[in-house]
Interface confidence: low
């Protein structure tokens, strides 16, 4: 557990008066309908709120929307609907906010049936002004910004055309027809799939994958017989139909599709799917669905090339394609992921890994909790976390797990303590050490958010009744104060705080209901006066991440290095501030066999850390032999785990084997593989 002081809960001095002076109400002159909120830029304080109200008429739906803007983190809003000519905005496209601090916003308008194309409103100045632009097409998708250049936009039309703009939506050009899916890659590259015959659906498995690196001046076909494709980190993945049957396999490229290698993953049939759960520049987590409608599959983790995969977790819960998985990247501590497995008895259990998928374990039982009715042994059980799947099943879970990169070690989640996830009303638990240890933080379900890089946690009880109380903690959830932010309770709909958890402002959204009408209302509370002073050096303490055994020289070593962080003391009530940067001191660890994965053609016997040569390469491995590039088939049996920085120590070097000798197969020769290039 991260350092903390075991002390009686001290009240924050005069907090009611301080918060009352910093609570700002805004009543929106709107019927209820729906509301969406977007932050424009980072640390700008600019928020856009779009309210929409649908009136169903006999022949058509009449819509009305209003646009509001705040530039003080939601304390005050101005109605700027006139800037978009009082046009009805299509909420399904949301507000397309430009990357980084570009200040760019695109709103897509609803247009009448007979029009030639759609209409957008564009702003380059953080929504101070908008320009109306009529489109030469009807958009099917939201405008997508190039990550490298916010002036470059792409969109798909309802007629499957791929349209590109080079001047932030002023002019548009159709660069290709019959396009199913398009994505920006790195360096303003666009990848997209095309169909030749009927449609995207009819040609699934016979699509072509194309690439343009010059916004449509020239193209290269980089794949055929494509089912779908995806980008993750520096990897480009494509699922490709096999020559002989209806199965498909993953192929991977690390050079934007110029060359491909077959991933050493099981092939999947028509009813199965692959899913990239997480990816970075080092490696990828891949889910491979089990045959049949099981609701689970297997997680595999890749090597640094995306080619060789190690089985990471069996019976991983993932309902049908595009369905629900609880897979969660704990962003507050390197290497930590949480997900759910479906056990043999069909109960759902939470698993956690601290080493990027190397080993998975159950979550440690919180010390201040009892095992519930799901536990066979009342003294031995685990914490089980509610995430996307529980939410989809309409359990009483208002929020998924929460972690923030700049609130080091903090994870907040709904959970239950037993042998499996319980359908009973959950409580809220917190970990201050990235998931190693947990404490019950709040009784019953709550909405929660992190402010000031962890300096403040705010929570609101999840209730069907109107609410007027907010809870806050300045010591990572140990002690809570309650503040009544309004005399008149509201029907609560959501908490909003600036992404990145650096802000000290929280907005509480809801609506008031009277006999005749209901109106949107927001309360923005600024906690700056609760954290009166800036944090100083004495307010921080050194914390070694991943520490499980302080007596061990290698304590804290994960993926070949350990990291010491400066953490805010729980007893310090001060501002980290908007400019707070996480201070960490890495140190390299000595290598052990645990820092290596077994290369293609090798495996680890149970309870052994050495990689042993497989007697022969069976099954689909033969395809890998057939299509595998020469350099991938020579190995010494070990590859360093992606992202592992260890040095020295164990160096498992031995003679390099040429696996080609084992590759004997009657399959087609590689030359038979289809490929064409423009």
């Amino acid at each position: 557990s991260a350092p903390g002081e075991d002390e009686e809960c001290g009240r924050v001095r005069d907090f009611v008066a301080k918060l009352a002076n910093n609570t700002h109400q805004h009543v929106f002159d709107d019927l209820r309908g729906s509301v969406s909120l977007s932050w424009v830029g980072d640390s700008t304080g600019v928020i856009l709120v779009l309210t929409t109200f649908h009136v169903p008429l006999v022949i058509m739906t009449f819509g009305q929307s209003k646009l509001y803007r705040s530039e003080d983190y939601g304390k005050n809003f101005k109605d700027i609907t006139d800037l978009i000519n009082n046009t009805f905005i299509r909420t399904e496209f949301g507000m397309a906010i430009g990357p980084e601090n570009s200040g760019k916003v695109v709103l897509t308008a609803e247009v009448s049936g007979g029009s030639r194309g759609g209409r957008i409103f564009r702003s380059s100045d953080f929504a101070k002004n908008f320009v109306q632009t009529d489109l030469p097409f009807h958009p099917l998708t939201q405008m997508m910004y190039s990550p490298q250049n916010s002036d470059y936009l792409l969109a798909l039309s309802t007629e499957n055309g791929l349209w590109v703009s080079k001047n932030f939506g002023g002019k548009w050009e159709e660069i290709h027809k019959a396009v199913c899916l398009a994505k920006w890659g790195s360096d303003n590259t666009i990848f997209f799939t095309t169909y030749a015959n009927g449609s995207c659906k009819a040609d699934l498995g016979a699509l072509e994958l194309w690439r343009t690196s010059d916004l449509g001046k020239s193209f290269k076909t980089i794949g055929v017989k494509i089912y779908s494709f995806g980008l993750g980190g520096r990897f480009l993945f494509a699922s490709v139909m096999a020559d002989k049957d209806t199965t498909r396999r993953i192929h991977v490229s690390t050079d934007q599709g110029d060359t491909w290698s077959m991933a050493q993953l099981p092939s999947v049939g028509q009813e199965q799917f692959y899913s990239i759960l997480a990816a970075n520049d080092d490696m990828v987590f891949m889910h491979v669905d089990e045959p049949g409608d099981t609701g689970f599959g297997t997680i595999f983790t890749s090597d640094d090339r995306g080619i060789v995969y190690s089985k990471s977790l069996d019976r991983h819960l993932y309902t049908t394609t595009g369905g629900e998985t609880d897979f969660t990247n704990v962003t507050s501590l390197r290497g930590v992921y949480i997900t759910s497995v479906l056990s043999e008895d069909n109960s759902i259990q939470t698993m956690i890994t601290f080493d990027q998928g190397g080993r998975w374990t159950h979550l440690r039982k919180p010390e201040n909790s009892e095992c519930d009715a799901t536990a066979k042994n009342k003294n031995e059980c685990s914490l089980h976390i509610h995430a996307s799947y529980s939410i989809s099943q309409k359990l009483n879970v208002p929020m998924a797990p929460l972690s923030e990169p700049n609130a080091v070690g903090i994870v907040i989640a709904h959970g239950s303590v037993g042998d499996a996830i319980s359908v009973m009303v959950p409580d809220v638990y917190i970990s201050d050490d990235g998931g190693y240890s947990w404490t019950k933080m709040l009784e019953g379900p709550h909405y929660y958010t992190i402010l000031d890089s962890g300096g403040i946690i705010v929570a609101i009880e999840h209730s069907s009744r109107p609410i007027n109380v907010i809870k806050f903690s300045t010591d990572e959830g140990q002690c809570w104060q309650t503040y009544t932010f309004t005399r008149d309770p509201i029907y609560f709909t959501g908490l909003a705080s600036e992404p990145g958890a650096r802000s000290m402002n929280i907005s509480i959204w809801g609506f008031t209901e009277s006999f005749l009408t209901s109106q949107w209302v927001s309360y923005t509370i600024d906690f700056k006066d609760i954290l009166e002073r800036n944090c100083e050096e004495k307010d921080y303490t050194i914390w070694l991440a991943h520490s499980t055994d302080p007596e061990d020289y290698e304590d804290g070593c994960i993926l070949g290095y350990k990291e010491q962080f400066l953490r805010l003391r729980k007893s310090s009530v001060c501002q980290n501030g908007r400019d707070y940067v996480v201070t960490k001191q890495p140190s390299i660890c000595l290598c052990s066999l645990e820092d290596f994965l077994c290369d293609f053609g090798y495996y680890r016997p149970e309870n052994d850390s050495k990689c042993v040569e497989q007697p022969e390469l069976k099954g689909h491995d033969l395809e890998f032999c057939l299509y595998g590039r020469e350099e991938h088939l020579t190995t010494n049996g070990y590859r360093k785990i992606p992202g592992d920085k260890c040095q020295g120590g164990v160096n498992p070097v031995r003679e390099v084997k040429d696996l080609k000798k084992k590759c004997t197969s009657n399959f087609l020769s590689p030359e038979k593989q289809n490929s064409k290039s423009n």
């Epitope: 303490t541 050194i542 070694l544 499980t548 055994d549 302080p550 007596e551 061990d552 020289y553 290698e554 304590d555 070593c557 010491q564 140190s587 390299i588 000595l590 290598c591 052990s592 066999l593 645990e594 850390s609 040095q647 020295g648 120590g649 164990v650 160096n651």
Partner: antibody, heavy 129, light 107 residues
Framework: QVQLVQSGAEVKKPGASVKVSCKAS????????MSWVRQAPGQGLEWMGI????????SYAQKFQGRVTMTRDTSTSTVYMELSSLRSEDTAVYYC??????????????????????WGQGTTVTVSS | EIVMTQSPATLSVSPGERATLSCRAS??????LAWYQQKPGQAPRLLIY???TRATGIPARFSGSGSGTEFTLTISSLQSEDFAVYYC?????????FGGGTKVEIK
């Protein structure tokens, strides 16, 4: 018995480099790390860094980063410490000391710190113009 | 880095008396602490490791205690051969660091 025998005294000019050797005997050379510690005249002990004889990996104190290089020769069970860009304040006795931090072959194991249990006799390095 | 502070810098004790040496760490070092004895012209000698365990061949009059940030070396009855400089050293987190030393001299 377990012994660490260091090379003889050295006199160097400022800006030069010195390389001190430390030959281990009486135990398995690769089973223990080796630390280097120095002591300026009339001063306390100052840890310089550590080397793992198995892979040759090192960890240096920030103060010596860029100036110190620790190497090992497993065939002769010898570790070396080279200090470059010498200045007068580098005048000191340099010790090698067997460090107990064992090599983690598998996951974390509980290993208390056993202290630097065997020390070389010391090598006096004098830096003077 | 972890700073180790020893006190007192000099301790004057008569033979046969008890000597208590103190060592404080700027942050917890758990029990990853060792004590060394050094006599003029000699290399240091390990006395205590793991904060409280005597090294091989060290007489029972030497004892160590403490964990976290506060440590003590006690010499129950000083002998003439015990007059020397004593250093504490942490090995909780790199870089290893030594205290400034306590000189035990004859009163």
């Amino acid at each position: 018995q377990v012994q660490l025998v260091q090379s003889g005294a050295e006199v160097k000019k400022p800006g030069a480099s010195v390389k001190v050797s430390c030959k281990a005997s009486g135990y398995t050379f690769t089973s223990r790390y080796m630390s280097w510690v120095r002591q300026a005249p009339g001063q306390g002990l100052e840890w310089m860094g550590i080397i793992n004889p198995v892979g040759g990996s090192t960890s240096y104190a920030q103060k010596f980063q860029g100036r110190v290089t620790m190497t090992r020769d497993t065939s002769t069970s010898t570790v070396y410490m080279e200090l470059s860009s010498l200045r007068s304040e580098d005048t000191a006795v340099y010790y090698c000391a067997r460090d107990p931090s064992g090599i983690a072959l598998a996951g974390p194991a509980s290993r208390p710190y056993y202290g630097m249990d065997v020390w070389g006799q010391g090598t006096t390095v004098t830096v003077s113009s | 880095e972890i700073v180790m502070t020893q006190s007192p810098a000099t301790l004057s004790v008569s033979p046969g008396e008890r000597a208590t040496l103190s060592c404080r760490a700027s942050q917890s070092v758990s029990s990853n602490l060792a004590w060394y004895q050094q006599k003029p012209g000699q290399a240091p000698r390990l006395l205590i490791y793991g904060a409280s365990t005597r090294a091989t061949g060290i007489p029972a009059r030497f004892s160590g205690s403490g964990s976290g940030t506060e440590f003590t070396l006690t010499i129950s009855s000083l002998q003439s051969e015990d007059f020397a400089v004593y250093y504490c050293q942490q090995a909780r987190l790199g870089p290893w660091t030594f205290g400034g030393g306590t000189k035990v001299e004859i009163k």
